[in-house]
């Protein structure tokens, strides 16, 4: 990747990622410098007859750093603080080639939950107020509610009326998605409304 257009790479929290390095064809490489947010990460001197000299200059990421045979950078056990700008400078006898990357760390979605604040009206219509959540949600998480393949809401919240006298059994499904994972959780309108009905009759007695 040229320095003008960084390659955006997605990494998953806790997993590994490789920033691919392309070599100038047919040229002998003198050394390679890897930088993270403009700070030196590693300095590599390739050798034709023996293993390369690898000097890791950033102790914070050092134990999680590895390099492939082509000196691509491998970073394991990814942390949120690994997010940022990476650059590789390949120096040959005649030129210096720069490759730029932007690494963004995404979380696998976990622990989807639905909370219910529903109420029963005197005409026995049940109004469902459902809220969907996942652990550590950020702005890259998309929520939606579906029933029978139709999207009823594009937000974590769903408000819908359900009348047991005219509606058949209905499941409402929350789907939470980001670029690397998706989770879903279904609730039964009949079950939720029966619970509300029990509470309603209990308070009337």
């Amino acid at each position: 990747q040229s320095s003008l257009t960084p390659l955006m790479v997605n990494g998953i929290l806790g997993e590994s990622v490789t920033l691919p390095l392309e070599f100038p064809a047919g040229e002998k490489v003198n050394f390679i410098t890897w930088l993270f947010n403009e700070t030196s990460l590693a300095f590599i001197v390739p050798h034709e007859t023996k293993s390369p000299e690898i000097h890791v200059t950033n102790p914070k990421q050092g134990k999680r750093l590895n390099f492939t045979q082509s000196y691509s950078l491998q970073l394991s056990n990814l942390k949120m603080e690994d997010t940022g700008s990476y650059r590789a400078q390949i120096s040959t006898k005649t030129s210096a080639k720069l490759s730029s990357y932007t690494l963004r760390i995404l979380r696998q979605l976990r622990n989807i939950q639905v909370t219910n604040h529903s109420q029963l009206f005197q005409n026995m219509t049940c109004e469902l107020h459902l809220t969907c959540s996942v652990e550590d949600a950020d702005d890259n998480v998309s929520f939606r509610w579906e029933a029978l393949g139709n999207t009823l809401s594009s937000q974590p919240n769903l408000t819908v009326s359900w009348d047991p006298r005219i509606s058949s059994e209905q499941d409402y499904t929350c789907i939470a998605e980001n670029a690397v994972s998706n989770l879903s959780f279904s609730v039964s309108a009949q079950k939720l409304c029966e619970d509300v009905k029990i509470q309603y009759t209990d308070t009337k007695m």
Partner: antibody
Framework: QIQLVQSGSELKKPGASVKVSCKAS????????MNWVKQAPGQDLKWMGW????????RYADDFKGRFAFSLDKSVNTAYLQISSLKAEDTAVYFC???????????WGQGTTVTVSS | QIVLSQSPATLSLSPGERATLSCRAS?????MHWYQQKPGQAPRPWIY???NLASGIPARFSGSGSGTDYTLTISSLEPEDFAVYYC?????????FGGGTKVEIK
Amino acid sequence: QIQLVQSGSELKKPGASVKVSCKASGYTFTNYGMNWVKQAPGQDLKWMGWINTYSGEPRYADDFKGRFAFSLDKSVNTAYLQISSLKAEDTAVYFCARDYGRWYFDVWGQGTTVTVSS
Amino acid sequence: QIVLSQSPATLSLSPGERATLSCRASSSVSHMHWYQQKPGQAPRPWIYATSNLASGIPARFSGSGSGTDYTLTISSLEPEDFAVYYCQQWSSTPRTFGGGTKVEIK
């Protein structure tokens, strides 16, 4: 049927403020996020951000933090975009667009032209 | 932010010809949406989640792709298809649109 109807064109002087409205009908307003998109003359589309129509919480793209404000009046199913301290570069057509999920904008307002000129 | 590059910027074709519009993302995205816009009008939803046609969109349109490369194809151009087409990603905030491909009559 489902539709979004926006307020009419506005001609404003630099430094003034403008408030664009977007009235929704034909669906449950509080179930779908409302997005705002800018299109400057001869330019492409630029996503400004969105507002959660249930909670009223706005989210702004970095380029639209500061002078831009999204708000709601749920009683009349209307979303608003307010721009303060108007500049010449705010001259554009502003669209509201409903999010159907996965930030797919399935219904758009007709657009409101805001012209900033001294 | 994820940058979407559409190519070509302009496609000059005759009715009946096949049109292939490309959208390349600077980072892998899970799906792509497409919109059509005609002069003086709001964009119209065209294809959602890579390959699903929006309501009322004719079957001569199709969408495909994955990762960083997505395509909108029109199998045989009709006069009403000449317009600007935008791709849009949802995987990362800010949601971004491509620069558009203008399909014009040759």
